[in-house]
Interface confidence: low
């Protein structure tokens, strides 16, 4: 027999299948051009001294063989004696170590058996009704295919699935989507409706993230507020990385989880923009305001659960930085200006009340006045800080108020609203004898003392009703008692107390009359 022909004689080895576990398998035969054909197969086991024979039986019952030697691939033409237009049965017999090993048979019509490619190029992945949908362009001239997929997770072996028949120039497959683990998919194709046609190779891996991106497990710390009124947010713990199946390790496009940082500035609600989203790697500087910080994880299927932290406001106060002048027309605040063309946000809220009750006002961009100060004024009619109570004031500044991460804290301080000089007048002034020439004066704390840094001092005034002489005694703001000495028995005195702030003299309390009784000796 000629080597290019299928030899219609008995093969040169005994016909006895060894039944061994090794041997030829996975036989594929297809047309590779208008008149040429190729069969290829795998051989399992030691290859030394193995001779392969491709066997073919025609529908008439006549059988022939091609001798392939040690090769596991063989080409022949339509003139080789094998009927290509009718169904034939092919298998491989391998003669090794004095025994014959046989592959499973394939029955097919060679002319219509085309070598099918796996999906090539881009495989688009999307989510459809809780399942995974893959879509790809059908390889050229290969419309009409059966498609299979296999998939695995980091902890499970390959599982096989069926995509069903495809008859279009785009093909698609619905596959299971895992909730919490990444998957690796591969696809393969074979000719539709061609009996015994061979499967293509598996496609390149398609790496698919879980439906739910992993919840970010991160921790933040925030530094002290610097001289510039800003503090740095730092990441203490990086997010955990997703475990990937074997074929997705290294470069695995599709499984990426992106983490974004969402900042919500809670203070100064009257500003234009309250939230900003940043990449997690780019840690921002914050003002001393209160913030909510969320880390949002997302993958190609969308966002997952987020983790939220509250960053409280920096409550470090600057008692001397703010000057407040109260006039007949209203109130004006002055503070050291930050720079040219700054927008300021002045926020105030009654002390001891929920942060949600803060009120604020945004200034137009302003330059420093000749004394280097920035100002904010309001009229009495506006009602701003009009009640006689303690307010916590914070002033923020920004040259770009629309950019959330460019605000800084100028100062935080306390202010007593309304008519502070009258409201702060001490009440319940009482006088008790202390010794033969001294008395102890006590009073209830001024309302101003509820406002840290506002009450500068108490002043106690004692007036001798006979000589009309007056003496004044300054008392520390933390004290509510003073001893007046050097008094004379039998003389009438009046005592008054007032509470002063740094910028306002208080109103005297009602005069309290007293005298030290003359001691009569026996």
């Amino acid at each position: 027999c000629r080597t290019s022909e299928c030899c219609f004689q008995d093969p040169p080895y005994p016909d006895a299948d060894s039944g061994s576990a090794s041997g030829p398998r996975d036989l594929r035969c297809y047309r590779i051009s208008s008149d040429r054909y190729e069969c290829s197969w795998q051989y399992e086991g030691p290859t030394a001294g193995v001779s392969h024979f491709l066997r073919c039986c025609l529908s008439s019952g006549r059988c022939c063989y091609f001798a392939a030697g040690s090769a596991t691939r063989l080409q022949f033409s339509d003139q080789a004696g094998v009927s290509v237009l009718y169904t034939v049965t092919l298998w491989v017999e391998s003669w090794a170590r004095n025994q014959t090993e046989k592959s499973p048979e394939v029955t097919l019509q060679l002319y219509n058996s085309v070598k099918y490619e796996p999906p090539l190029g881009d495989i688009k992945v999307s989510k459809l009704a809780g399942q995974l949908r893959m879509e790809w362009e059908t390889p050229d001239n290969q419309v009409g295919a059966e498609v299979q997929f296999r998939h695995r997770t980091p902890s499970s072996p390959w599982k096989l699935g069926d995509c069903g028949p495809q008859d279009d120039d785009t093909e698609s497959c619905l596959c299971p989507l895992e909730m919490n683990v990444a998957q690796e998919f591969q696809l393969r194709r074979r000719q539709l409706g061609s009996q015994g046609s061979s499967w293509s190779k598996w496609s390149s891996p398609v790496c698919v993230p879980p439906e739910n991106p992993p919840q970010p497990q991160v921790r933040f710390s925030v530094e002290q507020l610097g001289q510039d009124g800003r503090r740095r947010l730092t990441l203490k713990e990086q997010p955990t990385q997703l475990e990937l199946p074997e074929g997705c390790q290294g470069l695995a496009p599709g499984t990426e989880v992106t983490y974004r940082l969402q900042l919500h500035m809670l203070s100064c609600p009257c500003k234009a923009k309250a939230t900003r989203t940043l990449h997690l790697g780019k840690m921002p500087y914050l003002s001393g305001a209160a913030y909510n910080v969320a880390v949002i994880s997302s993958n190609q299927f969308g966002p997952g659960l987020n983790q939220t932290w509250h960053i409280p406001a920096d409550t470090h106060t600057e008692p001397v930085a703010l000057n407040i002048s109260v006039g007949t027309n209203g109130t004006t605040m002055y503070w050291p200006a930050r720079a040219q063309s700054m927008t300021y946000c002045i926020e105030w809220q009654p002390v001891g009340q929920d942060g949600g009750l803060a009120t604020c006002s945004l200034t137009a961009p302003q330059d420093p006045d000749p004394a280097g100060m920035a100002t904010y004024s309001w009229s009495r009619e506006s009602g701003a800080m009009g009640q006689e109570k303690c307010y916590y004031i914070t002033i923020f500044a920004s040259a770009h108020p629309e950019k959330l991460t460019l605000w800084s804290t100028v100062l935080s301080t306390y202010h007593f609203g309304g008519n502070a000089s009258a409201a702060g007048t001490p009440h319940h002034v009482s006088v008790k004898n202390h010794s033969l020439d001294s008395v102890s004066v006590d009073w209830a704390p001024s309302l101003l003392s509820t406002c840290p840094g506002v009450l500068k001092e108490y002043v106690v005034r004692c007036r001798d009703e006979d000589s009309k002489q007056v003496s004044e005694h300054p008392v520390q703001p933390t004290e509510t008692q003073v001893t007046l000495s050097g008094l004379r028995a039998g003389v009438a005195y009046t005592v008054q107390v007032r509470a002063d702030t740094a910028w306002l003299r208080g109103v005297w309390s009602q005069p309290q009359r007293f005298s030290i009784e003359v001691q009569v000796s026996d």
Epitope: G164, P165, D167
Partner: nanobody, 118 residues
Framework: EVQLVESGGGLVQAGGSLRLSCAVS????????VAWSRQAPGSQRELVAR???????NYADSVKGRFTISRDNDKNMVYLQMNSLKPEDTAVYYC????????????WGQGTQVTVSS
Amino acid sequence: EVQLVESGGGLVQAGGSLRLSCAVSGIAFRYNSVAWSRQAPGSQRELVARITNSARTNYADSVKGRFTISRDNDKNMVYLQMNSLKPEDTAVYYCGAGRSMTGDVAYWGQGTQVTVSS
């Protein structure tokens, strides 16, 4: 539940035109092939035209050049524009969608009558 509702049938003179419409619901329309078939009295049902999800079309030899199938993925609609109608085009026209495991059309509508008079 998959539903296909045909409309646009009626009586027309030979040489005239008709446009059939079909509203499809209950399947992922944009990922499926859609088709029109017809059945004349006493005859077998025949596939008239088919359009795949990527807008590839096939026509029966008897209607080539006269009938045009089209689809609107946004509206889940399929259309059959029938021009130069002949008396032999008289039949009940059915709209079909989806693929069965054999590759055939899986679902069919109730049909709309088209009558071409000479």
